[in-house]
């Protein structure tokens, strides 16, 4: 049994780190493999993660952690029974992928404006809470040529779009993702998308 692609891990900087790797052949990850992890810290214990399959030769493991701080460093050992397949380390603060924003809602009852709101995925006491900026993707199912990214570089998780910039009488979808500038993170996954119908019509005199 051999590791084809070494484990690569990202942290949500809250309670979960996700490690993914590829094996040299088809593997029943949960039956054959264990990923052991231990914080380099006084009197810390070794913890075990049971991986899941992620495609035919891919495995993924979700490591449960405490809150993350910048000093944290983990040793990782990938075992197949009594055989050590791979040994490495992981510093969560240097490999952060934020959680996806949630509760994306579209408010169309505001005159002339489409208001999008969503929730910050972190509690106020988390370091990432005040560091997230967002990208909102809006596209149309009726007009495949229409797709826009709106960068939200302020802290408030809202975006206002003049309804007049969207075509009337067609449906749009929106999704949002986040990243944290000062932690040099990757982008989060996209939130689930939300659909709405743009019924706004310009006043007659403006037509």
């Amino acid at each position: 049994m051999k590791v084809l692609q070494e484990p690569a891990c990202v942290s949500d900087y809250m309670s979960i780190s996700t490690c993914e790797w590829k094996m040299g052949g088809p593997t029943n990850c949960s039956a054959e493999l264990r990923l052991l992890y231990q914080l380099v810290f006084q009197s810390s214990e070794t913890h075990t993660c049971v991986p899941e399959n992620n495609g035919g030769v891919g495995c993924v493991c979700h490591l449960l952690m405490d809150d993350v701080v910048s000093m944290d460093n983990y040793t990782l050992d990938l075992w197949a029974g009594q055989q050590l397949l791979w040994k490495g380390s992981f510093k969560p603060s240097e490999h952060v992928k934020p959680r996806a924003p949630g509760n994306l809602t579209v408010h169309t009852n505001v005159s002339d404006t489409v208001l999008l709101t969503w929730s910050n995925p972190y509690p106020p006491d988390n370091y990432l809470y005040n560091d997230l900026t967002y990208a909102v993707n809006i596209w149309s199912e009726n007009d495949p040529a229409y797709s826009r990214i709106h960068n939200v570089t302020y802290l408030k998780p809202t975006l206002r779009i003049p309804a007049s910039t969207l075509k009337s009488g067609i449906s749009y979808r929106a999704r949002v993702r986040a990243w944290a500038q000062h932690y040099n993170t990757t982008w989060s996954e996209w939130s689930p998308s939300t659909k709405w119908y743009n019924s706004y019509r310009e006043p007659f005199e403006q037509r």
Partner: antibody, heavy 125, light 112 residues
């Protein structure tokens, strides 16, 4: 009541052996790391050894490494210190102390918040 | 190994007056914001040590609020706002960030 009670001290000749015990009660013993600290007559406190809650990880002062062995029996809520090749400079009162909560991924530290009454070890010919 | 240096080594105090003991470590004991791995212990004559302060500034259960800990990184202080007769004994700082745990030399607090 959270309590630690040491035993096993006594008079031993240089080169001899002693086994100290520390019985814990009033807390979930296996969840906590444990520590031994000693105090030579008229001197300050000196850390001797520590062990994680599971017993998988042990730590020793250079002065006792290779001679002392820390262990625990969580089924008996008891901590041990096996002392071999004893020297005159090992003469001290030995205390056990409750250390950090080590079942969490990052052990939670609340100080060495409970200490035993101490057991005296005298090494002399 | 980390070295812990305590001062003064002797501290005569008048009851009701404040007292202050300093402890300096040879390397930072700050693991993360608010988590300085330094403790303060009091050992009264003929007794086992007792915990006063842990993680730099957190008062242990049952410890009177006249005791307080402060500092960060390498410099730490134990303050007693108003010394009482029962406070006499040896005070020790200890680094608990990593083994070997290291105690300061001890400060003998006595009543004038």
């Amino acid at each position: 009541e959270v309590q630690l009670v040491e035993s096993g001290g006594g008079l031993e000749q240089p080169g001899g052996s002693l086994r100290l015990s520390c019985a814990g009660s009033g807390f979930t013993f296996r969840d906590f790391a444990m520590t031994w600290v000693r105090q030579a007559p008229g001197k300050g406190l000196e850390w001797v050894s520590s062990i994680s809650g599971s017993g998988d990880n042990t730590y020793y002062a250079d002065s006792v490494k290779g001679r002392f062995t820390i262990s625990r029996d969580n089924s008996k809520n008891t901590l041990y210190l096996q002392m071999n090749s004893l020297r005159a400079e090992d003469t001290a009162v030995y205390y056990c102390a409750k250390d950090r909560l080590s079942i969490t991924v990052r052990p939670r530290y609340y100080g060495l918040d409970v200490w035993g009454q101490g057991t005296t070890v005298t090494v002399s010919s | 190994d980390i070295v812990m240096t305590q001062s003064p080594l002797s501290l005569p105090v008048t009851p009701g007056e404040p007292a202050s003991i300093s402890c300096t470590s040879s390397q930072s004991l700050l693991y993360s914001i608010g988590y300085n791995y330094v403790d303060w212990y009091l050992q009264k004559s003929g007794q086992s040590p007792q915990l006063l302060i842990y993680l730099g500034n957190k008062r242990a259960s049952g410890v009177p609020d006249r005791f307080s800990g402060s500092g960060s990184g390498t410099d730490f202080t134990l303050k007693i706002s108003r010394v009482e007769a029962e406070d006499v004994g040896f005070y020790y700082c200890m680094q608990s960030l990593q083994t070997p745990y290291v105690f300061g030399q001890g400060t003998k607090l006595e009543i004038k």
